[in-house]
């Protein structure tokens, strides 16, 4: 049966026993800045082009054992959530991956900047259709990272990022705090903000909306047919990147402002239990859970 | 995210160093009274001292970025410091990534075209 997260973002009219807008997002290219990925996993084979871009710090610890499946874990799962054949949101979207996170899931602001610059240069060399950039990472507030995101957004690129998993104000993190970026928090099957160990999803006025981010089934790098459940604001951001890809594929001329407005318009309103957030943040945090547009756009979104 | 917000720095640390008018023998000294600022991550364990993104003013051309980077290296060498230019930015932001001692920050902030310098820091999969 359909995984809970795909059901949650699907308009009621389409909730049959399977989620199948088969060509969703086919006009859009989604860039993923993350770990290395297992691009020939059955769930994503032929959908993800691994670019030659790699800018990662060395792994910490003298005895770190680099294991391919662990190195690829985070990125493979997210690629599957965006465009996977069976558990993906935008099954028609093509992706390009850049490696900016090492085998421990760690990267640098500078490496991310160089990755964003690489995307801009690729866009200039070979202009394609709409571009979505997924940044499933977070660091401390960074003026330069936010500035780079702003420049890329002004060049017509849609950037989607994780709000962060620190149970904290997203405005203290980057790229989550960049105003031009679509920042996504995580909710669970009960529409509760996601708790992750002692921490959880970030919140506050720098978050644009929430999306499913707990127990999300997706491609596992453990084997070429494996699936695994992962949780985090990265998974939530991947859902919104997929939804954005489908919206842009249906209406390629949408501006960032229009896309943001549509994402908000079609979101489920006031379903999140706000008691989870600190009292002073409740009024600032958007009570929105991302969803695809309903059947009025049948011809556009569900060809 | 969330358009329409005012700039929010949080606990973000900003060290402002006013530029001296006497410019260390530079031909192309900045206008008197302008300041370049230094930024670093508020979360200490995430800081990566020794690597810095030197961001230049918006209209700076690639050739000027390269020239500024070379100038920094030359001035650092005169003071007995080794530096390494790791990347020159162009296309999104003008500037360069440099590996150098933090002792050189004051010098770097006084270079022509410099808007601000940010110490590199870590980002993490979420």
């Amino acid at each position: 049966s359909i995984p809970w997260n795909l059901e949650r973002i699907t308009p009621p009219r389409y909730r049959a026993d399977e989620y199948q807008p088969p060509d969703g997002g086919s006009l859009v290219e989604v860039y993923l800045l993350d770990t290395s990925i297992q691009s020939d996993h059955r769930e994503i084979e032929g959908r993800v082009m691994v670019t030659d871009f790699e800018n990662v710090p060395e792994e910490d610890g003298t005895r770190f054992h680099r294991q391919a499946s662990k190195c690829d874990s985070h990125g493979t799962h997210l690629a599957g959530v965006v465009s996977g054949r069976d558990a993906g949101v935008a099954k028609g979207a093509s992706m390009r991956s850049l490696r900016v996170l090492n085998c421990q899931g760690k990267g640098t602001v500078s490496g991310t900047l160089i990755g964003l610059e690489f995307i801009r240069k690729s866009q200039l060399v070979q202009p394609v259709g709409p571009l979505v950039v997924l940044l499933p990472l977070a660091g401390g507030y960074s003026r330069v990272l936010n500035a780079a995101c702003q420049r890329l957004a002004r060049a017509g690129v849609v950037l989607v990022t994780a709000a962060g998993n620190f149970r904290d104000d997203a405005c203290l993190y980057s790229p989550a705090s960049a105003p031009e970026v679509i920042t996504v928090g995580a909710t669970n099957a009960q529409d509760q903000p996601v708790t992750l160990g002692t921490l959880g999803t970030n919140f506050g006025r720098c978050v644009d909306l929430f999306a499913p981010g707990e127990d999300i089934i997706g491609a596992s790098s453990d084997c070429s047919t494996c699936f695994v459940s992962q949780s985090g604001t990265s998974q939530a951001a991947a859902h919104v990147a997929g939804i954005a890809a489908m919206m842009l594929s249906a209406e390629p001329e949408l501006t960032l402002a229009e896309l943001r407005q549509r994402l908000i318009h079609f979101s489920a309103k006031d379903v999140i239990n706000e008691a989870w957030f600190p009292e002073d943040q409740r009024v600032l945090t958007p009570n929105l859970v991302a969803a695809l547009p309903p059947s009025t756009h049948e011809n556009l979104y569900f060809q | 995210g969330a358009m329409g917000q005012e700039d929010e720095d949080g606990d973000y640390e900003e060290l402002v160093l006013a530029l001296r008018s006497e410019e260390d023998g530079l031909a192309e000294a900045p206008e008197h009274g302008t300041t370049a600022t230094f930024h670093r991550c508020a979360k200490d364990p995430w800081r990566l001292p020794g690597t810095y993104v030197v961001v230049l003013k918006e209209e700076t051309h690639l050739s000027q970025s390269e020239r500024t980077a070379r100038r920094l290296q030359a001035q650092a060498a005169r003071r007995g410091y080794l530096t390494k230019i790791l990347h020159v930015f162009h296309g999104l932001l003008p500037g360069f990534l440099v590996k150098m001692s933090g002792d050189l920050l004051e010098l770097a902030l006084k270079l022509p075209h410099v808007d601000y310098i940010e110490e590199d820091s870590s980002v993490f999969a979420q």
Epitope: P22, Q38, D40, G46, R85, D86 | -
Partner: antibody, heavy 115, light 109 residues
Framework: QVQLVQSGAEVKRPGASVKVSCKAS????????ISWVRQAPGQGLEWMGW????????NYAQKVQGRVTMTTDTSTSTVYMELRSLSSDDTAVYYC????????WGQGTTVTVSS | QSALTQPASVSGSPGQSITISCTGT?????????VSWYQQHPGKPPKLMIY???NRPSGVSIRFSGSKSGNTASLTISGLQAEDEADYFC?????????FGGGTKLTVL
């Protein structure tokens, strides 16, 4: 254009081994693995397994597990399928195909097992 | 014994439409969006005609279409032509592998 080119026909004795090659070109090799499928005379298609060109991981069908080994040589963009302890039941045309989606196929390699 | 069940043969006259069924279980056809259909002429390798239930690769005639309901997938060929005479195989993912149907011989009368 995307192409998979296989090695030539083989005749083998029962108990012997055969190694079939498949050279890939015209696409980003690491974006797809290679599947191997065989077809006995007058019969249907049987999936034998898959190998990752990206990291060499394999996924073998239960029926041939223990007798089959798939390998890759990334320097020549070639994938190999070796089948051991051959019997007359292994007489078939062996195909390589691109990925699990099998959207592009090699021309086939006829393997005859006969005493 | 093939994992997926197809009729051994179907036939139709030129210009007619025919449908070939492919029945599996919830562990294969019913559980995945990845049902494919292949056409195979004698002495030739199979050719992909439909992938992911209903998608056509470029270069494949729009006369070929695919669908799925529950555990059964179907291939429909409209406006039959003489060159459509061939064997047709369906395939599906399973949790760890791939399975094919036994094949259907299409005869154009």
């Amino acid at each position: 254009q995307v192409q998979l080119v296989q090695s030539g026909a083989e005749v083998k004795r029962p108990g012997a081994s055969v190694k079939v090659s498949c050279k890939a070109s015209g696409y980003t090799l690491t974006s797809y693995g290679i599947s191997w499928v065989r077809q006995a005379p007058g019969q249907g298609l049987e999936w034998m397994g898959w190998i990752s060109v990206y990291n060499g991981n394999t996924n073998y069908a239960q029926k041939v597990q223990g007798r089959v080994t798939m390998t890759t040589d990334t320097s020549t963009s070639t994938v190999y399928m070796e089948l051991r302890s051959l019997s007359s039941d292994d007489t078939a045309v062996y195909y390589c195909a691109r990925g699990y989606g099998m959207d592009v196929w090699g021309q086939g390699t006829t393997v005859t097992v006969s005493s | 014994q093939s994992a997926l069940t197809q009729p051994a043969s179907v036939s139709g006259s030129p210009g007619q439409s025919i449908t070939i069924s492919c029945t599996g279980t919830s562990s294969d056809v019913g559980g995945y969006n990845s049902v494919s259909w292949y056409q195979q002429h004698p002495g030739k390798p199979p050719k992909l005609m439909i992938y992911e239930v209903s998608n056509r690769p470029s270069g494949v005639s729009i006369r070929f279409s695919g669908s799925k309901s529950g555990n059964t997938a179907s291939l429909t060929i409209s406006g039959l032509q003489a060159e459509d005479e061939a064997d047709y195989f369906c395939s599906s993912y399973t949790s760890t592998s791939m399975v094919f149907g036994g094949g259907t011989k299409l005869t154009v009368l």
